[in-house]
């Protein structure tokens, strides 16, 4: 039995983090951090289920190096969520994510992935 | 309301084989990644093995690898483990539980929030 | 692999605070997720993430990170709060495992 996934690539602004090289390099404590925030995060927005997780995580440097950008794959199981929705749920979350997590997020975009998507896939 | 029902315990002897089963309900099943985690007499949890949403990624401790087999049947919401060649220190009570995540896709763990009520194993001659 | 580890015994007067900490190198990736086990039932997840509670765990419960430490903090230690905890997270050098800390018991006095 074949389970269909859908992928959503998200890009969003952290723009009360200043990026550094560390945030190329995964094995630095910035970058496990921010990462680890972020995973979370979206197992706290996406929680009312069909939310696979998320791959491909890319940490930029925004306008002037001022900010950080992320950029991401989501997952879900097909049929449980379309972009709107996964657009419109992390909106809503921004306030939530700058108590718990101190991220002050800006500038969402969210888009479909066109099929045929790899994404890395963990281990369980 | 969310629960793992386990079954499929027993005495057997080293050498032997038992299977478990765990059957869930009250979640989308297929949503989440599972595990089985055991708890020797007096001792304290020990994870055994996990299994991915889609079964895609499966992991085992060392201790187990090569004699015990996890599987899940999404169908049927149950989550299973063989076990094989069994020694007298894999005598233990074992659990199953939900993990929080799906298990795959940046596979970051975060815990397991449900669990069932446990289920022995005794290994004995 | 890799281990984490638990003081085996803490203690704690009633009403007061209490930290059970758990130490790993797998902790600098992962956050832990603390588990309270009382004798002869299945483990409970108390805190999971950089300090999430699963819905009808109380608030006197709260988890943080520093570094390859996470530590589970009790404020106001009530006497049902007397169990076995044990921490947890993934294995940071081997990707597809789990691991659990030995255990703390907690006290109640």
């Known amino acids: 039995l074949s389970t269909g996934v859908s992928f959503f690539f998200l890009s969003f602004h952290i723009s009360n983090l200043q990026f550094n090289s560390s945030l190329e390099d995964p094995s630095t404590d910035y970058y496990q951090e921010l990462q680890r925030d972020i995973s979370e995060m979206f197992l706290q927005i996406y929680k009312q289920g069909g939310f696979l997780g998320l791959s491909n995580i890319k940490f930029r440097p925004g306008g002037g190096g001022g900010s950080v950008v992320v950029q991401l794959t989501l997952a879900f199981r097909e049929g449980t969520i379309n972009v709107h929705d996964v657009e419109t749920q992390f909106n809503q979350y921004k306030t939530e994510a700058a108590s718990r997590y101190n991220l002050t997020i800006s500038d969402v975009s969210v888009s479909d992935v066109p099929f045929p998507f790899s994404a890395q896939s963990g281990a369980g | 309301q969310v629960q793992l029902v386990q079954s499929g315990g027993g005495l057997v002897q080293p050498g032997g084989s038992l299977r478990l089963s765990c059957a869930a309900s009250?979640?989308?099943?297929?949503?989440?990644?599972m595990h089985w985690v055991r708890q020797a007499p007096g001792k304290g949890l020990e994870w055994v093995s996990g299994?991915?949403?889609?079964?895609?990624?499966?992991g085992y401790a060392d201790s187990v690898k090569g004699r015990f087999t996890i599987s899940r049947d999404n169908a049927k919401n149950s989550l299973y483990l063989q076990m094989n060649s069994l020694r007298a220190e894999d005598t233990a009570l074992y659990y199953c539980?939900?993990?929080?995540?799906?298990?795959?896709?940046?596979?970051?763990?975060?815990?397991?929030?449900?669990w069932g009520q446990g289920t022995t194993a005794t290994i004995s001659s | 692999s890799s281990e984490l580890t638990q003081d085996p015994a803490v203690s704690v007067a009633l009403g007061q605070t209490v930290r059970i900490t758990c130490q790993g190198d797998?902790?600098?990736?992962?956050?832990a997720s603390w588990y309270q086990q009382k004798p002869g039932q299945a483990p409970v997840l108390v805190i999971y993430?950089?300090?999430s509670r699963p819905s009808g765990i109380p608030d006197r419960f709260s988890g943080s990170n520093s570094g390859s430490t996470a530590s589970l903090t009790i404020t106001g230690a009530q006497a049902e709060d007397e169990a076995d905890y044990y921490c947890?997270?993934?294995?940071?050098?081997?990707?597809?495992?789990?691991?659990f800390g030995g255990g703390t018991k907690l006290t109640v006095l």
């Open positions: 797998s902790l600098r990736s992962y956050y």
């Open positions: 299994i991915s949403w889609n079964s895609g990624s499966i």
């Open positions: 993430g950089k300090n």
């Open positions: 539980a939900k993990d929080i995540g799906s298990g795959s896709y940046y596979n970051y763990y975060y815990g397991m929030d449900v």
């Open positions: 009250g979640f989308t099943f297929d949503d989440y990644a």
């Open positions: 947890n997270s993934r294995d940071r050098y081997g990707n597809s495992l789990v691991i």
